[in-house]
Interface confidence: medium
């Protein structure tokens, strides 16, 4: 730490991991345990952010940066900083305020956290359904039917099914 | 520039009390301690203490409590060392030093003798 | 209290020799408060090198320090003649402050 020396406020001299200490000390103190200063001049030190719970661990404070948590198993982080846990779910499923739910026909989800998404609307684009979409797949377009040469085969687009996602048979 | 100018050279008998001046120049007198060290004829240094130049407040080391005060005259930017009940013991050079926010003695004086002889 | 020990306490080197002198602490010592003067014969102490490893206004380049926990050291990379002089380290720990006995440094 390369202090430029000042004359009208020395608490300015102070590296990250203490605090100015100015009044009563004249000088500036390391940051107590369990706390820290991540830039110079600070007149107190942070309390350092404990990972309880479902977060965990995934940086220890030092008296220079806070401590960075991420989420135990079965769990992602949401917000800046992970600051909240949300609850996994499986591929094809999307968290609602009763839990983790199926992804319903014409929508998918090919993580464990976020919402089911429309499946892609192959038509909208001029093309035509390469290979059909499941609760945890987006559907594969492939090219238009008149890209096709003569005597090709095309799938044709799946009618409405009971079962998500799945041609009838 | 910072300076810090002692009170010249003592020669006391022992029982008697001396009292050392420090002045500081060149830089806001409050802002900064004030620590006061000894060194012996060919010996190296002790931390005898400091004074608080913003609450006046003094602290001396274990080796320096009893007949040993620090005080300040703000107004002048001096601070002081008196020994009373002068020691033979006590013959060495006595040198304020501007106590650096990071625990370092950044300004010395010139160092003042104080010699104890009967 | 803190107690610096420094060795050697006398060493002696030619000009253009490289020496390197030691200061370990009984406890450790975070590296920001670790100090380093120089005092010539019959001259007040300067602060020659702070925080460890900063060398002070007007230090020639040829000093350098480096150190963590309880031992510390101050190299000078090629002697000089006006290098010759007692080099007291110093911490701040605990509201004390400790010295060093010193390492003087003579040049042949």
């Known amino acids: 730490f390369e202090r430029t020396r000042s004359l009208q406020d020395p608490c300015s001299n102070c590296p990250a991991g203490t605090f100015c200490d100015n009044n009563r000390n004249q000088i500036c103190s390391p940051c107590p345990p369990n706390s820290f200063s991540s830039a110079g001049g600070q007149r107190t030190c942070d309390i350092c952010r404990q990972c309880k719970g479902v977060f965990r661990t995934r940086k220890e404070c030092s008296s220079t940066s806070n401590a960075e948590c991420d989420c135990t198993p079965g769990f992602h982080c949401l917000g800046a900083g992970c600051s909240m846990c949300e609850q996994d779910c499986k591929q094809g499923q999307e968290l609602t305020k009763k839990g983790c739910k199926d992804c319903c026909f014409g929508t998918f989800n090919d993580q464990k956290r976020g919402i089911c998404r429309p499946w892609t609307n192959c038509s909208l684009d001029g093309k035509s359904v390469l290979v059909n979409g499941t609760k945890e797949r987006d559907v594969v377009c492939g090219p238009s039917p008149a890209d096709l040469s003569p005597g090709a085969s095309s799938v044709t687009p799946p009618a409405p099914a009971r079962e998500p996602g799945h041609s009838p048979q | 520039q910072i300076q810090l100018v002692q009170s010249g050279p003592e020669l006391k008998k022992p029982g008697e009390t001396v009292k050392i001046s420090c002045k500081a120049s060149?830089?806001?007198?409050?802002?900064?301690?004030m620590n006061w060290v000894k060194q012996a004829p060919g010996k190296g240094f002790k931390w005898m203490g400091w004074?608080?130049?913003?609450?006046?407040?003094?602290t001396y080391a274990d080796d320096f409590k009893g007949r040993f005060a620090f005080s300040l005259e703000i107004s002048a930017s001096t601070a002081y060392l008196q020994i009373n009940n002068l020691k033979n013991e006590d013959t060495a050079t006595y040198f304020c030093?501007?106590?650096?926010?990071?625990?370092?003695?950044?300004?010395w004086g010139q160092g003042t003798s104080v010699t104890v002889s009967s | 209290e803190n107690v610096l020990t420094q060795s050697p306490a006398i060493m002696s080197a030619s000009p253009g020799e490289k020496v390197t002198m030691t200061c370990r602490a009984s406890s450790s010592v975070s590296s920001s408060y670790l100090h380093w003067y120089q005092q010539k014969s019959g001259a007040s102490p300067k602060l020659w090198i702070y925080s460890t490893s900063n060398l002070a206004s007007g230090v020639p380049a040829r000093f350098s320090g480096s150190g963590s926990g309880t031992s510390y050291s101050l190299t000078i990379s090629s002697v000089e003649a006006e290098d010759a002089a007692t080099y007291y380290c110093?911490?701040?720990?605990?509201?004390?402050?400790?010295f060093g006995g010193g390492t003087k440094l003579e040049i042949k």
């Open positions: 060149g830089y806001t007198f409050t802002n900064y301690g």
């Open positions: 004074i608080n130049t913003y609450t006046g407040e003094p």
């Open positions: 110093q911490q701040y720990s605990a509201y004390l402050y400790t």
């Open positions: 030093a501007r106590r650096d926010y990071l625990g370092a003695m950044d300004y």
